[in-house]
């Protein structure tokens, strides 16, 4: 019981694990136009992994998708790589997974074969959490880069008298969405591995052993060998529990003009 | 069509207090950005208050922070302006607009004599 | 705060000829996310709110004559009127759109020669 409730669990913090790096990867707010002790515009910037948006005080947002790919620069298309590897991994692990959960019967399908199916889906998940998670941390990093590199060089002076206020960016929504669903793909991946300890049949084999005693002769013979993950040492004799067959680009969101009534 | 009209100006004294209202229709009101400018006579238009669309965000010139409050109700369709402590200073017609692509002012009121005088 | 100069003060042209009507911001109005500047040409007739021309310094209002062009960039910026009629006669007024508080140039007072 216990090792199916860790295998659904798994399954189930996996599941929004994924959600939310879909979620982060397409959301808008990678970055945001950092606002403290900063001249107050009556626009705000942010950007995303593939476009950037302008919000403006009257209530119009613009955003611009990235038209170019060469033309990027290449710690976005590694972020953009790895959220999208991790994305891969993370659902074909989900499928993966699907089909190894222990209340779901498929078949004849062995005891075996579902373990090796519930670790390989957490071995995915674990992978997939990790993409998101260095994806984010990329990302973070080359913010945080920027970030100083602007403020060492705030105001640009323009002929001595005129100054451009660079934008500065700081982390969005998107970095902390990214983080955590990492961060719970990779919890599911570890609960997927665990339970994949349980559901393997490890019956260990004994050779038969003859123990001559005096004055009597008896022999021991327990049941033939079963496949084992190799997981762990534990010799004792398991009972195999069968859970049954249970039925269980240039874009603008602009209203229009005056968005009559 | 657009239509903002004020109502609410006057005379007052120095130290005094009035509320401007501005009643907007033809637009859906809350998904814009309002502003009030104000104008005294022979002078350039000078921007008083606007209120950002997408949060309660308020801004205000130094002129006029703290004894000025700008606030709308989406429900009525309504902007208004508070002024506390008027001064002479402050005598000026007063607009209220609509604000637009790029952060301008598409839809003008036809504006409302203020006059502060003793 | 954004000081927005206006040249000239006032403006005689004849009719038919071109005006050209200049403004300058002591900081860049160019906003580097969406590469546009934040800057707004307005006309104000006697007795009258004003009336919007243009926004983002060269996106010209529908309804407004196309002999009226907004150009410029950054800090610099004009309004040229390539013909001049009689019924442009009006103070006109560029406006900072970018950095809170807003601020409006001291207005140029355009006359018939």
């Known amino acids: 019981m216990a090792v199916t409730a860790c295998q659904g669990l798994g399954f189930v913090v996996s599941l929004i694990g994924i959600a939310g790096i879909i979620a982060a990867t397409c959301m808008d707010q990678w970055s945001t136009q950092d606002l403290y002790n900063n001249p107050v515009t009556a626009v705000f910037n942010y950007q995303g992994l593939w476009r950037s948006c302008v919000r403006e005080s009257s209530g119009f947002t613009e955003c611009r998708g990235y038209f170019t790919l060469l033309g990027l620069p290449a710690m976005l298309q590694a972020v953009r790589a790895l959220m999208i590897v991790g994305i891969v991994l993370g659902a074909i692990g989900l499928l993966v997974s699907i089909f190894a959960l222990k209340c779901i019967r498929i078949g004849s399908m062995e005891d075996s074969a579902k373990a090796n199916m519930t670790l390989t889906s957490g071995i995915m998940f674990i992978v997939s959490g990790l993409c998101a998670i260095a994806g984010v941390s990329v990302f973070a990093n080359m913010l945080v880069t920027n970030f100083w590199m602007s403020t060492a060089n705030m105001y640009t002076g323009m002929g001595g008298m005129v100054q451009t206020v660079q934008t500065r960016y700081t982390f969005g929504a998107a970095l902390f969405v990214g983080w955590v669903a990492g961060g719970l793909t990779l919890i599911g991946g570890v609960m997927m591995c665990i339970a994949c300890r349980g559901l393997a049949p490890e019956e260990t084999n004994y050779k038969a052993v003859s123990y001559h005693a005096s004055g009597h002769s008896v022999a021991y013979k327990p049941g033939g060998f079963k496949a084992s993950t190799g997981f762990g040492s534990n010799t004792k004799n398991k009972k195999i529990y069968d859970g049954g067959a249970r039925t269980e680009d240039e874009v603008q969101s602009y209203p229009s003009k005056h968005d009559y009534v | 069509e657009v239509q903002l009209v004020e109502s609410g100006g006057g005379v007052v004294q120095p130290g005094g207090s009035l509320r401007l209202s501005c009643a907007a229709s033809?637009?859906?009101?809350?998904?814009?950005?309002m502003s009030w400018v104000r104008q005294a006579p022979g002078k350039r238009l000078e921007w008083v208050a606007t209120?950002?669309?997408?949060?309660?965000?308020?801004f205000y010139p130094d002129s006029v922070k703290g004894r000025f409050t700008i606030s709308r109700d989406n429900s009525k369709n309504t902007l208004y302006l508070q002024m506390n402590s008027l001064r002479a200073e402050d005598t000026a017609v007063y607009y209220c607009?609509?604000?637009?692509?790029?952060?301008?002012?598409?839809?003008w009121s036809q504006g409302l004599s203020v006059t502060v005088s003793s | 705060d954004i000081v927005i100069t206006q040249s000239p003060d006032s403006l005689a042209v004849s009719l038919g000829e071109r005006a050209t009507i200049n403004c300058k911001s002591s900081q860049s109005l160019l906003n580097s996310g969406n590469q546009r500047n934040y800057l707004t040409w307005y006309q104000q007739k006697p007795g009258q709110p004003p009336k919007l021309l243009f926004y983002?310094?060269?996106t010209r209002e529908s309804g407004v004559p196309d002999r009226f062009t907004g150009s410029g960039s950054g800090t610099d910026f004009t309004l040229t009127i390539s013909s001049l009629q009689a019924e442009d006669v009006a103070v006109y007024y560029c406006q900072n759109a970018y950095y809170y508080p807003f601020t409006f140039g001291g207005g140029t007072k355009l006359e018939i020669k």
């Open positions: 209120f950002s669309s997408g949060g309660d965000y308020t």
């Open positions: 983002w310094a060269s």
């Open positions: 033809g637009f859906t009101f809350s998904k814009f950005g």
């Open positions: 607009a609509k604000l637009y692509y790029g952060n301008s002012m598409d839809s």
